[in-house]
Amino acid sequence: GITIPRNPGCPNSEDKNFPRTVMVNLNIHNRNTNTNPKRSSDYYNRSTSPWNLHRNEDPERYPSVIWEAKCRHLGCINADGNVDYHMNSVPIQQEILVLRREPPHCPNSFRLEKILVSVGCTCVTPIVHHVA
Amino acid sequence: GITIPRNPGCPNSEDKNFPRTVMVNLNIHNRNTNTNPKRSSDYYNRSTSPWNLHRNEDPERYPSVIWEAKCRHLGCINADGNVDYHMNSVPIQQEILVLRREPPHCPNSFRLEKILVSVGCTCVTPIVHHVA
């Protein structure tokens, strides 16, 4: 990996061993304030592989609310507006980082956790295995 | 929101004010280790709105490497394998949390940051505005 020269003004680290505990400022800096509002929120309805969004809430996690996508159909919507089952609607999944309260119910102590979330759906051609 | 009864075994919090600084254990717990490998990594190629994945690296961020999707075409692939420009390939974007080293180059001090990433692409029907 890349070696980062250490800033002499860094806070002292108590524990140099893993599992590594670090200080994190929860005052979120949002880099997306100037992102284009055209990134349409209606893709879930206009897609040929449309999806619904479901609220996943967990008070022991930060962020406590995550929205998960669930494809509406097994197939994809064709030009006539019907479901074509020769194509497949599949969820696009991404691993994201969240903070899990550890020990449980502690407001100031967390552990990093990776979770897999479904962000939306896409239409794919099915894999067909031909027997020799 | 949901009130969480405080665990008496929680570490002491030095600073009760915002911006709130918390302790985070970076020894990541992966909740997805046993999810099925069938969540195919080849959707980017098989999709009717295929995409390429680009590596975005930033040593001041945790995770330092994030993969970003970029749609290959403006249109979508039709049944004949050609690009149909009457449909649109669009990126599905998601806001994710990352840790930004703050002050810069510090190994044990971070600030939460929200960034917008493109996870994959989906094929949508275009919005057509009819002029009166």
């Epitope: 996943n56 669930k70 097994l74 089952y85 067909v128 295995h129 027997v131 | 999810t35 069938k38």
Partner: antibody, heavy 126, light 111 residues
Framework: EVQLVESGGGLVQPGGSLRLSCAAS?????????MCWVRQAPGKGLEWIGC????????YYASWAKGRFTISRDNSKNTVYLQMNSLRAEDTAVYYC??????????????????WGQGTLVTVSS | DIQMTQSPSSLSASVGDRVTITCQAS??????LSWYQQKPGKAPKLLIY???TLTSGVPSRFSGSGSGTDFTLTISSLQPEDFATYYC??????????????FGGGTKLTV
């Protein structure tokens, strides 16, 4: 270790009720898993009862099971349940809990069941 | 509901034989079909999903084919551990939120 463990089976009288539990370990219900119940009468074939989506709570049932059988889940306990009412002698079977093979946001449990519990025997008899 | 008809219901074969089991759906389920193997006193084991995709860890002598209403499970060269009962299962859901999950009657494969 990833596993499913059923419990709650036993002897019940005709007309009685029973609630079976299926505790999952090694994976979390956080997100979309389809958890299903399947039964097998002694010496007979497999019979699908129904499934629940742990993400949004949507349930799917075999037509014969609607009304008498109810599937629910408690994500905080990583457990799914099968509530069986108005039990009859023909409901005597080994009841299996199983997980659909595909994780995360598919429209239906369409990928087969890759993880099964050991089964719990339910006997309906007077 | 969709009916799944499996044939034959029983089959005798020898080690090394090529064996074919068929499954017919009462209406099209496209490629939404799974195959399972079950041994006495054990839970079923998923072999194939989406008609032809082999589950991780399943030997390549097992293969599946078909779409629509007609499906086939083939064991290219029978091994002693393959003697068991085999089931097909539909996994098809439609846009009207009707979901069809039905097992075939099973095929008992004996020596």
């Amino acid at each position: 270790e990833v596993q499913l463990v059923e419990s709650g089976g036993g002897l019940v009288q005709p007309g009685g009720s029973l609630r079976l539990s299926c505790a999952a370990s090694g994976f979390s219900f956080s997100g979309f898993y389809y958890m299903c119940w399947v039964r097998q009468a002694p010496g007979k074939g497999l019979e699908w009862i129904g499934c629940i989506d742990t993400g949004d709570g949507t349930t799917y049932y075999a037509s014969w099971a609607k009304g008498r059988f109810t599937i629910s889940r408690d994500n905080s306990k990583n457990t799914v349940y099968l509530q069986m009412n108005s039990l009859r002698a023909e409901d005597t079977a080994v009841y299996y809990c199983a997980r659909d093979a595909a994780y995360g946001g598919y429209a239906y449990p369409a990928h087969g069941m890759d993880l099964w519990g050991q089964g719990t025997l339910v006997t309906v008899s007077s | 509901d969709i009916q799944m008809t499996q044939s034959p219901s029983s089959l005798s074969a020898s080690v090394g034989d090529r064996v074919t089991i068929t499954c017919q759906a009462s209406e099209s389920i496209y490629r939404y079909l799974s195959w399972y193997q079950q041994k006495p006193g054990k839970a079923p084991k998923l072999l194939i999903y989406l008609a032809s995709t082999l589950t991780s860890g399943v030997p390549s002598r097992f293969s599946g084919s078909g779409s629509g209403t007609d499906f086939t499970l083939t064991i290219s060269s029978l091994q002693p551990e393959d003697f068991a009962t085999y089931y097909c299962q539909s996994n098809f859901g439609t846009a009207s939120t009707t979901y069809y999950n039905t097992f075939g009657g099973g095929t008992k494969l004996t020596v």
